[in-house]
């Protein structure tokens, strides 16, 4: 059975051209985590592995960033950006944990973080 | 096997500068954040930058920006610290770190810096 | 920046006995905190991960729990190779932070 839940950041907002660290937090399960991937709609931007560490898509190396921890840096935001973000936990035994972020990057300066909610 | 092999000691005059190494072997050493802790006569731990090999992206505690520099050399899988401007306060065992999935998980065994005159 | 901060900062204890050492976090870091072992004249080395995570290679005697701000790190047990300093680490954000540090003592 599958017991954890991800909290991620939520829905936010973000300035173009500037930066935010999306994340995710996986708790309330004793399941070992394998891999994490991050993803945008059907894109993959990153995969961090057990065994091998960090891969940053090629499409997307000059501006994602890993981290802080298991989170993901997007830098240089433009409003093509905007959209759904998923953080897929990989994990044994229990299987996929997935979480959604919805990033819009706004044109002027009045980009406001939203609130935090949780997905079981 | 991963490890991380760091120079036993360094010894250096005040106001003198040095390049600590840390060589990585036995994993994908540009997939990996490349962190530095810095440890005075066995009290805590700071955390003073890290480094990653992939991109050369750093960050810095605000208290190391004017003090260390971090680099890499990815065609030999050695990360540096260059610290500058060396004071007493900056003797210490200065220890990198690997982070992965699995947070600091592989160590190195420190170099003890003296700074004395 | 996050502070961590550490209590006891020193435990004297027996082997045999159970201990819970506290790190607090000074903002909210979700499940972000990972504990340390360091026995003199050696590197630090991981216990437990992301709160609660297991590392591979560590007794089950080691065990985390917490989230938010309030994490303990209990040791069922005590054995002799388990004496030393324990610290915590914050990962939720740049820069990462260090507690202060807990010394488990033979009483």
């Known amino acids: 059975m599958m017991t954890g839940t991800i909290e991620t950041t939520g829905n936010i907002s973000a300035e173009k051209g500037g930066s935010i660290i999306l994340q995710c937090h996986l708790s309330s399960t004793t399941a070992q985590v394998t891999q994490v991937n991050w993803e945008q709609q059907d894109q993959l931007l990153a995969i961090c592995n057990a065994d091998l560490g960090w891969h940053i898509s090629p499409s997307f190396k000059d501006r994602v960033a890993p981290g802080p921890g298991l989170g993901l840096t997007l830098q240089s935001l433009t409003v093509n950006d905007t959209g759904e973000y998923f953080c897929i936990y990989h994990t044994y035994p229990d299987g996929t944990y997935t979480g959604r972020i919805f990033l819009e990057v706004l044109e002027s300066s009045v980009a406001e973080h939203g609130a935090r909610f949780q997905i079981p | 096997q991963v490890q991380l092999q760091q120079p036993g000691s360094e010894l250096v005059r005040p106001g003198a500068s040095v390049k600590l190494s840390c060589k990585a072997s036995?994993?994908?050493?540009?997939?990996?954040?490349m962190h530095w802790v810095k440890q005075r006569h066995g009290q805590g731990l700071e955390w003073i930058g890290n480094?990653?090999?992939?991109?050369?992206?750093?960050n810095y505690d605000e208290k190391f920006k004017n003090k260390g520099t971090l680099t890499v050399d990815t065609s030999s899988n050695i990360a540096y610290m260059h610290l500058s401007s060396l004071t007493s306060e900056d003797s210490a065992v200065y220890y990198c770190?690997?982070?992965?999935?699995?947070?600091?998980?592989?160590w190195g065994q420190g170099t003890t810096l003296t700074v004395s005159s | 920046d996050i502070v961590l901060t550490q209590s006891p900062a020193t435990l004297s204890v027996t082997p045999g006995d159970s201990v819970s050492l506290s790190c607090r976090a000074s903002q909210n870091i979700r499940n972000s905190l990972h504990w340390f072992q360091q026995k003199s004249h050696e590197s630090p080395r991981l216990l437990i991960n992301y709160a609660s995570q297991s590392i591979s290679g560590i007794p089950s005697r080691f065990r985390g729990s917490g989230s938010g701000t309030d994490f303990t790190l209990t040791i069922n047990s005590l054995e002799t190779e388990d004496f030393g300093v324990y610290f915590c680490q914050q990962s939720n954000s740049w820069p990462y932070t260090f507690g202060g540090g807990t010394k488990l003592e033979i009483k």
């Open positions: 770190a690997r982070e992965g999935l699995y947070a600091f998980d592989y």
């Open positions: 036995g994993y994908t050493f540009t997939s990996y954040w």
């Open positions: 480094i990653f090999p992939g991109s050369g992206t750093t």
